[in-house]
């Protein structure tokens, strides 16, 4: 079995000749790719096109968020006859073309993943030279970034009536469950605020009233791990302030 450029084999009538039928533009991307924060991920993208064995100038583009209008995170250009796609844009230097664009492969490698990279990505190819044509994936590939919990902020704040409250904010994917422990608390899930708009991986838990001096510990946990951080409350007798 011999594969033609579109992975099909056609026998011409009464002959042994395999022909490559006229192609249409198409792009093949998986719906989702998952990887852990700190690791690298590969966003696969292959395409077919109607221009047979095009070897003219070519530009490969990846954008984030939305097709056609989203910000570009990667762009490279290959000269006529060249497999070498010279990078013109790589956001934070973390994106590089892994596929061979001359073999219709625009797969992209993303290094040092962060939770902020969790979004949809769209590949695009542009032909120049004798042929002027372009095509972009409409549905894109969702990059799902998972991460063990990390406590990004823990603090004690004054509240009305000379009282104090504690706040703990953590990030992770899946979003971590938060629990407080401390003097006279045992283990308390406390009041957990749902993830904030635009900050889907951040979760905040509040201890509304700290009644005892001592050490208060916030623990964040999800299926990938756990993290904890502590604050200390020491109130000066006869004063309305506190040392934390």
């Amino acid at each position: 079995f011999v594969r033609t450029k579109i992975d099909t084999t056609e026998n011409l009538l009464n002959t042994e000749v395999h022909s490559s039928p006229a192609q249409r533009w198409s792009m093949q991307v998986p719906p989702e790719v998952s990887a852990e924060a700190g690791d690298a991920a590969v966003l696969p993208c292959t395409f077919t096109h109607p221009h047979r064995h095009y070897d003219g100038p070519l530009t490969a583009i990846w954008r984030a968020g939305e097709p056609y209008a989203g910000p570009q995170v990667f762009r490279c250009a290959a000269a006529r006859g060249s497999e070498l796609c010279q990078t013109a844009l790589s956001l934070h230097g973390r994106f590089r073309l892994l596929g061979n664009p001359r073999r219709n492969d625009l797969s992209l490698r993303v290094e040092r993943l962060a939770l902020a990279d969790d979004r949809r990505y769209f590949c695009r190819v542009e032909f120049a030279g004798d042929v002027h044509d372009r095509y972009e994936s409409r549905h894109g590939v969702r990059l799902h970034v998972t991460a063990a919990p990390r406590i990004v902020n823990i603090s004690v704040l004054p509240s009305p009536a000379h009282a104090f409250r504690a706040l703990c904010t953590a990030e992770g994917e899946p979003p971590p469950a938060l629990a407080w422990s401390g003097p006279a608390l045992g283990n308390s899930l406390a009041a957990v605020r749902s993830p904030r708009e635009g900050h889907g991986h951040l979760v905040t838990a509040e201890l509304p009233a700290l009644t005892h001096d001592g050490r208060y510990t916030c623990t964040a946990a999800n299926s990938l791990g756990r993290s904890e951080a502590s604050v200390y409350l020491f109130r000066f007798h006869g004063a309305s302030g506190a040392s934390t």
Partner: antibody
Framework: EVQLQQSGAELVRPGASVKLSCTAS????????MHWVKERPEQGLEWIGR????????EYDPKFQGKATMTADTSSNTAYLQFSSLTSEDTAVYYC?????????????WGQGTLVTVSA | QIILTQSPAIMSASPGEKVTMTCSAS?????MHWYQQKPGTSPKRWIF???KLASGVPGRFIGSGSGTSYSLTISTMEAEDAATYYC?????????FGGGTKLEIK
């Protein structure tokens, strides 16, 4: 089955010309680039150039520009390589090659080679 | 043009031995391709896009590298691996081959 059948060995005089043929079966040459590669015992492989048989678009290694002429006849599914003003440096085996089935890498199918000997 | 320099030009290895040959490019390339040729036969595509094995190539062959430095490694040499190996670049016209590494069996 994909095959490239090349013409037989040639013994030619210095200064003469020679035209080699490569007939493809199993695919239409108009759908894929056809390449010519030169092999000499001590020099290894050299890419001469490639032709797009459908529109005649050609790319040569500058070293062979003026020396080699690539043509193709899609009606007979045959590619040709003509060498002119032959010298002893042109004594070599010449292969025609296709990028058919490039999903599995370049230069997928090679002809059996044609030995050209330039000798007085 | 991009000049590909292969080393060593000739080498020999015993069965079971690990073998590494290199291909150095005069300018940066994005991929390297490798071909195997045995005496009296046409070359065969062997490794493409630096590290992908062509159909039928045993898994003991490993291609690696980037930029200007590439290598082909055979994890455990076998008698049938004795051949000449050529690297090839398509990162700029004119496309070029290396001078080849002839691998002999001891």
């Amino acid at each position: 089955e994909v095959q490239l059948q090349q013409s037989g060995a040639e013994l030619v005089r210095p200064g003469a010309s020679v035209k080699l043929s490569c007939t493809a079966s199993g695919f239409n040459i108009k759908d894929y680039y056809m390449h010519w590669v030169k092999e000499r015992p001590e020099q290894g492989l050299e890419w001469i150039g490639r032709i797009d048989p459908e529109d005649g678009d050609i790319e040569y290694d500058p070293k062979f520009q003026g020396k080699a002429t690539m043509t193709a006849d899609t009606s007979s599914n045959t590619a040709y390589l003509q060498f002119s003003s032959l010298t002893s440096e042109d004594t070599a085996v010449y292969y025609c090659v296709t990028d058919y089935d490039y999903d599995g890498g370049w230069f997928a199918y090679w002809g059996q080679g044609t030995l050209v000997t330039v000798s007085a | 043009q991009i000049i590909l320099t292969q080393s060593p030009a000739i080498m020999s290895a015993s069965p079971g031995e690990k073998v590494t040959m290199t291909c150095s490019a005069s300018s940066s390339t994005s991929f390297m391709h490798w071909y195997q040729q045995k005496p009296g036969t046409s070359p065969k595509r062997w490794i493409f896009d630096t590290s992908k094995l062509a159909s039928g190539v045993p898994g003991r062959f490993i291609g690696s590298g980037s930029g200007t430095s590439y290598s082909l490694t055979i994890s455990t040499m076998e008698a049938e691996d004795a051949a000449t190996y050529y690297c090839h670049q398509r990162s700029a016209y004119p496309w070029t081959f290396g001078g080849g590494t002839k691998l002999e069996i001891k």
